[in-house]
Amino acid sequence: ESALITQQDLAPQQRAAPQQKRSSPSEGLCPPGHHISEDGRDCISCKYGQDYSTHWNDLLFCLRCTRCDSGEVELSPCTTTRNTVCQCEEGTFREEDSPEMCRKCRTGCPRGMVKVGDCTPWSDIECVHKESGTKHSGEVPAVEETVTSSPGTPASPCSLSG
């Protein structure tokens, strides 16, 4: 249960800017790039680079654009119909199971293992045992430390790849 991180919205932004385009809702909904007015009569456009909506909606205000964290690069900017796309910087990755921050990729595999997968923005390097071909799981000491581990003893648990 603690893994479920949620975010409540901040106070709605004021939407009275005269330059915002308006159109009529369709079946009570507004198209991507718009939100609905409080009286439900108008669709008001989102502000480019500030907020967005990606689907037909009855939102009273558009959603705030994501700002990329330090350690991330912006792949594509926020538009009125699409949120910012951020990606971990080269040499770092973000796992689905621990998505809060970009983590540094390992620089090499432990003794007795070979690298079969490179560091990507969404995955660490992948190591397998030379002989058995089983995949390495869990934390791995730095390459320098693995040299000192006992022969035949893996530095951390291994599991069958599947």
Partner: nanobody, 125 residues
Framework: EVQLLESGGGLVQPGGSLRLSCAAS????????VGWFRQAPGKEREFVSA????????YYADSVKGRFTISRDNSKNTLYLQMNSLRAEDTAVYYC???????????????????WGQGTLVTVS
């Protein structure tokens, strides 16, 4: 542990209606956006609708716009999907889902969701 249990599916004639429910056993349900997805036989799971944490405002897929309505009751930790004017192409297993992280106010892609129910089958025939 996060548990989501869908109900309300069944067999319905074209043009008919169904109301799906999703009961959540997680204390943070009332502070999280939540969504409905569906998966037809042989097809990928697709977004149907998602609703804000406070129930004020929702997203709808083009294919269900004007026919489906999402709602929630945070006091009961329950999500609903009212489906009207059902069509044969709405036949699918319907899943409710909670996002895995809180960086999006209203997630609408499968990868943004990490907690899934077992699904309830809706057959329109």
């Amino acid at each position: 542990e996060v548990q989501l249990l869908e109900s309300g599916g069944g067999l319905v004639q074209p043009g008919g209606s169904l109301r799906l429910s999703c009961a959540a056993s997680v204390s943070t349900f009332g502070t999280s956006p939540v969504g409905w997805f569906r998966q037809a036989p042989g097809k990928e799971r697709e977004f149907v609708s998602a609703i804000r944490w406070d129930g004020v405002g929702a997203y709808y897929a083009d294919s269900v716009k004007g026919r489906f309505t999402i709602s929630r009751d945070n006091s009961k930790n329950t999500l609903y999907l009212q489906m009207n004017s059902l069509r044969a192409e709405d036949t699918a297993v319907y899943y409710c889902a909670l996002p895995r992280r809180g960086d999006s106010e209203l997630p609408s892609t499968v990868k943004e969701y990490g907690y899934w129910g077992q699904g309830t089958l809706v057959t329109v025939s």
